[in-house]
Amino acid sequence: SITTLRPQGSLRDEHHKPTGVPATARPSVAFNIRTSKDPEQEGCNLSLGDSKLLENCGFNMTAKTFFIIHGWTMSGMFESWLHKLVSALQMREKDANVVVVDWLPLAHQLYTDAVNNTRVVGQRVAGMLDWLQEKEEFSLGNVHLIGYSLGAHVAGYAGNFVKGTVGRITGLDPAGPMFEGVDINRRLSPDDADFVDVLHTYTLSFGLSIGIRMPVGHIDIYPNGGDFQPGCGFNDVIGSFAYGTISEMVKCEHERAVHLFVDSLVNQDKPSFAFQCTDSSRFKRGICLSCRKNRCNNIGYNAKKMRKKRNSKMYLKTRAGMPFKVYHYQLKVHMFSYNNSGDTQPTLYITLYGSNADSQNLPLEIVEKIELNATNTFLVYTEEDLGDLLKMRLTWEGVAHSWYNLWNEFRNYLSQPSNPSRELYIRRIRVKSGETQRKVTFCTQDPTKSSISPGQELWFHKCQDGWKMKNKTSPFVNLA
């Protein structure tokens, strides 16, 4: 049960001693500066207090310094994501110091013991930073700690303990068990650096969540709602791994945070945007695609520093693989009436036609229920850049004249003879691009033909001036 994962080890337990560590010659925490572009090469181990070694290892005092901090390990070895992240950082920031914090002996333990070791590892990282700070040219503001899973909380402790304030901490799906709801000083928190940005990719809302659910940074980004990542479904995992197991699915979703961060380093021309929103369901309804007042931000390495008093939860959709960028659109659809709906919701699809490309048939996800005589908001996204939107096609899935439909219509006619068919009246669709923030209004070609029934489609073109709302500053200012 979850209570077996209550936070353990505390100030009563001489907690500063590492837990479950074999007495070997190997240091329990090593600082390995990666100088070679070959990820398989060992690198150079720094030693606290040894200034000569700093020089020999090629440590650049004035450059940016990245500390990569891994998490809990079952294998006791570095996983492949670490090498990818090292390479991506070296490619992007050529002069930077890339230091791998190797705490494998303390992380290759029972999870509870590894958790209890995060504090002491954080202290060692802080100790290294304090020593580096003694050198005149070294600035803590140039330090960026990047922690994955348990490593995110190690980074938090390091930021907490260091004398001064580190420039940035990035938490890559910080661990959830034994950190959810704990005191602000026992986990990664906004106080731990000048800027703390977090990616949450595996936060289950039921049972034991591998990643932490609650926001712990200045900005907390939840790609795809922070739970189910595309490409990590059971079928995807079976296809890409020799043994498609639950643990591979967990690894896929949890590790996705790292790959999103790597993507932000290597695919600079395809930056992903996240949008501030109070929760995932509002985002899915397309309500939150605003960039006003810092409400949107780049994700990963390119995130802009935002130091708000309150946490900022942000959401985005992604592709299943690199590059992860998608293009978000908000559709505001005014549905005038909806005849004979019964309880069934219509299955609607939209196809967007742009100056660069056309989209696929995109489902309009009905998160709650369609509101009648009201504006319904939807979120759709495309994997390619469509350019300027030119027209769109709305399709109501269903067969117009099947025997089943005829029987249904006959039944409907018996109960409501005046309204025999299921019909939806839509005059216009207002579209806003999340990435460009441009708004366009689309109208039916013929204002008299604005109804749609199952199995039918309705075409929309950019509205003529007469259809647009008259407004001096912006034709769409009242539509936001």
Partner: antibody, heavy 116, light 107 residues
Framework: QVQLQQSGAELMKPGASVKISCKAT????????IAWVKQRPGHGLEWIGE????????KYNKKFKGKATFTADTSSNTAYMQLSSLTSEDSAVYYC?????????WGQGTSVTVSS | DIVMTQSHKFMSTSVGDRVSITCKAS??????VAWYQQKPGQSPKLLIY???YRFTGVPDRFTGSGAGTEFTFTINSVQAEDLAVYYC?????????FGGGTKLEIK
């Protein structure tokens, strides 16, 4: 076991300053935050702020910025809070507490009375 | 700042009864809530942290529950020595804030 021993009661004149001490034993003093909490008679608890002795980092409740100043001496395992420009509003019991899961352990409190 | 509200300033109960004290946060604090007991003339004591975890040595008649903005502290079988003021506190963000306290009186 963990213990926090606070200095004795103080009777102060308005406008004066007072420095309260909190001596910690039974744990690694430098690596846990020590908070200061105010309790006026018949009132609830008010968090003033906290200090991490090892790095001298502080966090203050903005209401007490300029009023309270935290320091710590790691050689004697003692945390201090100085209150300046005292008024009758500052008459209260002040507690130090060490934070881990929450405010795990508390000092016995120091009563400060401001009276002319 | 996050405001923690304990709606009952006083609660009266009898020995052996079950009593529940509620606390409401002005914004989501997830499960980052602690409960303290302050007996007359004593310092506060930590009973519950992270909304539902009992601190070391705390009797199991004391329980905590809740998440988000609504939290409950329960004493399952009140004893005479439970006469005290009970405070909730959020430890999600700085500044840490306490509820106003609920004084438990034994009939």
């Amino acid at each position: 076991q963990v213990q926090l021993q606070q200095s004795g009661a103080e009777l102060m004149k308005p406008g004066a300053s007072v420095k309260i001490s909190c001596k910690a034993t039974g744990y690694t003093f430098s690596t846990y935050w020590i908070a200061w909490v105010k309790q006026r008679p018949g009132h609830g608890l008010e968090w003033i702020g906290e200090i991490l002795p090892g790095s001298a980092k502080t966090k203050y409740n903005k209401k007490f910025k300029g009023k309270a100043t935290f320091t710590a001496d790691t050689s004697s395992n003692t945390a201090y809070m100085q209150l300046s420009s005292l008024t009758s509003e500052d008459s209260a019991v002040y507690y130090c507490a060490v934070y881990d899961y929450g405010a795990d352990y508390w000092g016995q409190g120091t009563s400060v009375t401001v009276s002319s | 700042d996050i405001v923690m509200t304990q709606s009952h300033k006083f609660m009266s109960t009898s020995v052996g009864d079950r009593v529940s004290i509620t606390c409401k946060a002005s914004q989501d604090v997830y499960t980052a809530v602690a409960w303290y007991q302050q007996k007359p003339g004593q310092s506060p004591k930590l009973l519950i942290y992270s909304a539902s975890y009992r601190f070391t040595g705390v009797p199991d008649r004391f329980t905590g529950s809740g998440a988000g903005t609504e939290f409950t502290f329960t004493i399952n079988s009140v004893q005479a020595e439970d006469l005290a003021v009970y405070y909730c506190q959020q430890h999600y963000s700085i500044p840490r804030t306490f509820g106003g306290g609920t004084k438990l009186e034994i009939k």
